[in-house]
Interface confidence: low
């Protein structure tokens, strides 16, 4: 970005100063500003130099540079007040032409930034501004009247008050033109269309705008179509519409239709698809997978994608077991219209329980038939650990039980002294079991695994720990041996990741 | 035949809590699906929902009265009961309980008030 | 909260007339949309639910139609037992809002 000296966003001098303004960029620089006399410029590869020896009320106005070969468009400006007793405003254009409802800026430029407390616009000959003229002033820019009327074509002056007195600028004539209308305003209803070959179909094409001199047709792939055109007149706009009735429809009738309307201003269009089908169709999707993992406690939302024609006329979500026989909630179930064709529904499971594991069918029936779509929702657990004594061939063994989903990998961990958990300094030996016995592994239900430690010599003043981790968190199961037999340590809580 | 209505007093003082009950018979707010709500009309102006209980005891409020009401449900008596807080002339209304339901398709989003009390006109007033 | 507009708030028809009332909603309830008709003294009696579905029992010439947020029930003839005054409700979310109620009267 190139950058102003000196470095202020405002300058402030008298008629007659010399001032002199440098701008210095990467590459060449150039000046805009407003055109005003005795300014010399000159230029040195990188910076441009802006200067006057003789300042006058015509060189207030803002100085910008900038960077033509900077791809960014930086640029910097300086705001110039030359403040002249006599002249409290600068005039650069005296016509401004808008179109109606555009802001006009009136570029008068004040001289002087202590004047700003005291302006105000109003019409030539001191007259105050039409009612409900809104207006806002910079003394950077001038006065902005916002959203310009037509009937606000005016001579305007700026006013400012200086000594007690009201100093006007030089008149302003501002030209509102009435807007020319643009294209018209299209409607194609419907924007989708949808019928099984034999029925009825209607189409209808409507065009508006505030001049009659406007044309309107319906084409059908690049066909116009000769259809009687009805007219209206309403609330300020003329309306011509275009209602193509097809009694008995057929494939012919299919494809791409376009509303078309023309005027002076150019042409809008508008386009939507007429599917002719043999028969009802109800077709189930979902972007999910059909097959879903969550942990135990977290929530989940089913979402079913339906494009159906006709209209559904049932829809159902239902829970297929294999554990309870309740069903979804009403409340927890919603339905959502994408199009005329095509609808979402939801289930949302919040906070899930071990007997909502299970499959869940939704369910959808129009005449074309039932359809479904089934997810299978298994919950995830944090391993729970059980150890007990046992023998086995004669083998003093310890037998660990983990029950979790995803499968849990079992470890055994002994370490010295008597503790609930074995840490990293106690440990003497760590054993991982790579291929526990797999005891139950029934589908929607926890895993469960054993694991065997045979133990030739339980040491009494050691414990023995069994720990289980999936993906879920982890569990542990502490073997105490004691002269009087064994004894065993659950922890106080399984560690748990919901 | 499903019936609701409504009972309580009349006449309440400003600052003194209302407590209305909805008597019910007809259906059961133990099925499925079944809600009740409670929606008042304050004379010669609109509708205005209140609150809902559903048959899970799940209770939805008005939340620019929300810490003024309190809806519960005796389903052994068959009845449901709106408590409303610190009354004021403004609530001078007439007060409807309305059953939600029961239900064509068990998860279709159609939750509306099918049957209506005949409505308690309730005055606060000193 | 949705906010419900309902037009026009009143309105006058002769037996015969098709009649219709519309409700505007601040954003999207998906069709999640019932109306009601009340007479003097009475409660409310559940016309049209879920837009356009007619609740049993209530007469065929009352239609409900609409999508996104713009909803319309429609009489196609009025009979003298009509007039009435109407609202629309929506239980797309909470809090639930009803409409500011049309009261069609007898011209």
């Known amino acids: 970005i190139p950058v102003i000296e000196p470095s202020v966003p405002e300058l402030v001098v008298k008629p007659g100063a010399t001032v002199t303004l440098r701008c210095v960029g990467n590459g060449s620089v150039e000046w805009d500003g407003p055109p005003s006399p005795h300014w010399t410029l000159y230029s040195d590869g990188s910076s441009s130099i802006l200067s006057t020896n003789n300042a006058t009320f015509q060189n207030t106005g803002t100085y910008r540079c900038t960077e033509p070969g900077d791809p960014l468009g930086g640029s910097a400006a300086i705001h110039l007040y030359v403040k002249d007793p006599a002249r409290p405003w600068n005039v650069l254009a005296q016509e401004v032409v808008v179109f109606e409802d555009q802001d006009a800026l009136l570029p008068c430029l004040l001289t002087d930034p202590v004047l700003e407390a005291g302006v105000s616009l109003v019409r030539v000959r001191g007259r105050p501004l039409m009612r409900h003229t809104n207006y806002s002033f910079s003394p950077w820019h001038g006065f902005t009247i916002h959203r310009a009327k037509f009937i606000q074509s005016q001579d305007y002056q700026c006013s400012a008050l200086m000594g007690g007195r009201k100093v006007m600028s030089i008149s302003i004539r501002l030209k509102v033109q009435k807007v020319i209308p643009g294209p018209p305003a299209l409607t194609l209803v419907p924007a989708e269309l949808v019928r099984i070959r034999g029925e009825a179909a209607q189409i209808v094409c409507s065009a508006s705008s505030v001049d009659v001199n406007f044309d309107v047709f319906l084409q059908h792939n690049n066909t116009k179509l000769a259809i009687p055109q009805q007219s209206d007149f309403h609330n300020n706009r003329y309306q011509k519409v275009l209602t193509l009735n097809l009694d008995q429809v057929d494939f012919q009738h299919a494809g791409n239709y376009s509303c078309v309307a023309s005027n002076v201003q150019g042409k809008h269009s508008t386009s939507m698809f007429f599917r002719v089908v043999e028969s009802a169709y109800l077709n189930l999707s979902s972007e999910q997978n059909l097959i879903q993992e969550v942990t135990v406690g977290e929530g989940l939302n089913l979402k079913v994608m339906v494009e159906a024609y006709p209209g559904l006329q049932g829809f159902n979500w239902t829970y297929l077991g294999p554990f309870s026989d309740h069903q979804p909630e009403p409340k927890l179930a919603n339905a959502t219209t994408k199009d005329t064709y095509r609808h979402t529904f939801t289930l949302s499971l919040p906070r899930l329980k071990p007997s909502e594991a299970g499959r869940y069918s939704f369910l959808a029936r129009n005449p074309g038939g039932w359809r479904a779509l089934t997810f299978e929702l298994t919950l995830r657990y944090p391993p729970e650990v059980s150890v007990i004594w046992t023998f086995i061939n004669g083998s003093g063994t310890l037998l660990c039980a983990a029950s979790g989903y995803p499968q849990p990998n079992v470890t055994w961990l002994q370490c010295s002294g008597h503790t609930d958990r074995c840490d990293e300094a106690q440990v003497l030996q760590v054993w991982d079991d790579p291929y526990p016995e797999v005891l139950s592994q029934e589908p929607f239900h926890k895993v469960t695994v054993q694991s065997l430690l045979t133990v030739e010599t339980l040491e009494h003043n050691q414990t023995y720990e069994c720990r289980a981790h999936n993906s879920v968190g982890s569990g542990s199961w502490a073997f105490i041996p004691i002269s009087a037999g064994a004894h065993t340590h659950p922890p106080d809580e399984f560690l748990f990741t919901p | 035949e499903v019936t609701l209505k409504e009972s309580g007093p009349a006449l309440v003082k400003p600052t003194q809590t209302l407590t209305l009950t909805c008597t019910f018979s007809g259906f059961s707010l133990t099925t499925y699906g079944m809600g009740v709500g409670w929606i008042r009309q304050p004379p010669g102006k609109a509708l205005e929902w209140l609150a809902n209980i559903w048959w899970d005891d799940d209770k939805y409020y008005n939340p620019s009265l929300k810490n003024r009401l309190t809806i519960s449900k005796d389903t052994s008596k068959n009845q449901v009961v709106l408590t409303m807080t610190n009354m004021d002339p403004v609530d001078t209304a007439t007060y409807y309980c309305?059953?939600?339901?029961?239900?064509?398709?068990?998860?279709?989003?159609?939750?509306?008030?099918?049957?209506w009390g005949q409505g308690t006109m309730v005055t606060v007033s000193s | 909260d949705i906010q419900m507009t309902q037009s026009p708030s009143s309105l006058s028809a002769s037996v015969g007339d098709r009649v219709t009332i519309t409700c505007l909603a601040s954003?999207?309830?998906?069709?999640?949309l019932a109306w009601y008709q009340q007479k003097p003294g009475k409660a409310p009696k559940l016309l049209i639910y879920?837009?356009?579905s007619l609740q049993d029992g209530v007469p065929s010439r009352f239609s409900g139609s609409g999508s996104g947020t713009d909803y319309t029930l429609t009489i196609s003839s009025l009979q003298p037992e009509d007039f009435a005054t109407y609202y629309c409700l929506q239980d797309s979310e909470y809090p639930w809002t009803f409409g500011g109620g049309t009261k069609v009267e007898i011209k």
């Open positions: 954003e999207d309830i998906y069709d999640n």
């Open positions: 879920y837009a356009s």
């Open positions: 309305a059953r939600i339901g029961p239900i064509k398709y068990p998860t279709a989003p159609y939750r509306y008030f099918d049957f």
